[in-house]
């Protein structure tokens, strides 16, 4: 039940990429506004975006708190210039979201390779660490701060004359991969934690060749 | 439940192709790496290729670089090992297995198998 | 590529027995060997991940060692259950690579 003239909330979906999180909902509204609120499990509900006719409200600043936390948050709808209105039941229309966990849900987002380093028949391939809106006293945690061990890169690394895709993995930000010298290679990353069964993947970085300005080639 | 489900094995002439399926349930392969690993009559397993669906990647062993080609339909769940100009020596069973790119474990759910006959 | 080379090709050996079966690698590939169980007209099961770690629902009598570049695979109190074939195989570097194999069977 609800007040005349309002629609409740639906397809309420979280969107989430390195722990910037925004909670997005349907419809557009005609004649009404939107409040959100947030609570963890066992917290109190704390109110967001105040009588927005938005579809989307930035949450960040609320799961950034505990990543590990499980939050779940709900959408309720007002009559458009008369908020104070309730449904029959004496509160405004809502619907709830599904629950959601950052640690385990946020996507992963695109890692970007720093640098590359080739001295002789090795090439140091270095991964920026990427800043969260995680803050532990108060500086912004990197993605690896807040992962730790749980978060791995793989290299895919390929001659620029050749298809084949060879992997290397590692639980730091660098690799340190063989190559044969003369020969001129490309490389992408991707953010894994092996540890998740759903967004366990990122996106692959941008391709970097040797030969770009990116690296530096050092004979020894 | 994780399983992968090979098929598309059967007896082929040298020369001749086929094309085989891995087709997984209980995870979404772009999620992981796919493998295929084959094994001789008899004999020890030997790596054949990958690939991670999430981008298409591959890489083949040399024993089948520029005959097979391995890839993955996101949207049915299968990965795909299309094998051309077959050899008596590619007589195998053919599994693939999953890969979790983890750094501590590389294989752990693989398929029942299936076999390649290359016989005249 | 890097080789595994892995010994003995076969055992004999009696229930309660104790089994060791190793693995060289033929460079450093740190700890990133497994070691699989293979059973007649079956896929290859995960035993062992990351050198010495027990995969989950592997019976505690199955462990992995590591000594730079050799692998160990034991076998504390042989099972009747246990004859079959044991692979390693590194997945440090592309291509992953397996030992030959070694099959334990009923002395």
């Known amino acids: 039940s609800g007040t005349t003239n309002t629609v409740a909330a639906y397809n309420l979906t979280w969107k989430s990429t390195n722990f910037k999180t925004i909670l997005e909902w349907e419809p557009k509204p005609v004649n009404q506004v939107y409040t959100v609120q947030i609570s963890t499990k066992s917290g109190d509900w704390k109110s967001k975006c105040f009588y927005t006719t938005d579809t989307e409200c930035d949450l960040t600043d609320e799961i950034v708190k505990d990543v590990k936390q499980t939050y779940l948050a709900r959408v309720f709808s007002y009559p458009a210039g008369n908020v104070e209105s309730t449904g029959s039941a004496g509160e405004p229309l809502y619907e709830n979201s599904p629950e959601f966990t950052p640690y385990l849900e946020t996507n992963l987002g695109q890692p970007t390779i720093q640098s590359f380093e080739q001295v002789g028949t090795k090439v140091n391939v270095t991964v920026e660490d990427e800043r969260t809106l995680v803050r532990r006293n108060n500086t912004f945690l990197s993605l690896r701060d807040v992962f730790g061990k749980d978060l791995i890169y793989t290299l895919y690394y390929w001659k620029s004359s050749s298809s084949g895709k060879k992997t290397a993995k590692t639980n730091t930000n660098e690799f340190l991969i063989d190559v044969d010298k003369g020969e001129n290679y490309c490389f992408s990353v991707q953010a894994v934690i092996p540890s998740r069964t759903v967004n366990r993947k990122s996106t692959d970085s941008p391709v970097e060749c040797m030969g770009q300005e990116k690296g530096e080639f050092r004979e020894i | 439940e994780v399983q992968l489900v090979e098929s598309g094995g059967g007896l082929v002439q040298p020369g001749g192709s086929l094309r085989l399926s891995c087709a997984a349930s209980?995870?979404?392969?772009?999620?992981?790496?796919i493998h295929w690993v084959r094994q001789a009559p008899g004999k020890g397993l030997e790596w054949v290729g990958y690939?991670?669906?999430?981008?298409?990647?591959?890489y083949y062993a040399d024993s089948v670089k520029g005959r097979f080609t391995i890839s993955a339909d996101t949207s049915k769940n299968t990965a795909y090992l299309q094998m051309n100009s077959l050899r008596a020596e590619d007589t195998a069973v053919y599994y693939c297995?999953?890969?979790?790119?983890?750094?501590?474990?590389?294989?752990?759910?693989w398929g029942q198998g299936t076999l390649v006959t290359v016989s005249s | 590529d890097i080789q595994m080379t892995q010994s003995p090709s076969s055992l004999s050996a009696s229930v309660g027995d104790r089994v060791t079966i190793t693995c060289r690698a033929s460079?450093?590939?740190?700890?990133?060997v497994a070691w699989y169980q293979q059973k007649p007209g079956k896929a290859p099961k995960l035993l062992i991940y990351?050198?010495?770690f027990l995969y989950s629902g592997v019976p505690s009598r199955f462990s992995g060692s590591r000594s730079g570049t050799d692998f160990t695979l034991t076998i504390s109190s042989l099972q009747p259950e246990d004859f079959a074939t044991y692979y390693c195989?590194?997945?440090?570097?592309?291509?992953?690579?397996f030992g030959q194999g070694t099959k334990v069977e009923i002395k």
């Open positions: 297995a999953r890969d979790p790119q983890s750094l501590f474990y590389p294989f752990d759910y």
């Open positions: 209980g995870f979404t392969i772009s999620d992981y790496v």
């Open positions: 690939i991670d669906p999430s981008n298409g990647y591959t």
């Open positions: 460079q450093d590939v740190n700890t990133a």
């Open positions: 990351s050198a010495s």
């Open positions: 195989q590194q997945h440090y570097t592309t291509p992953p690579t």
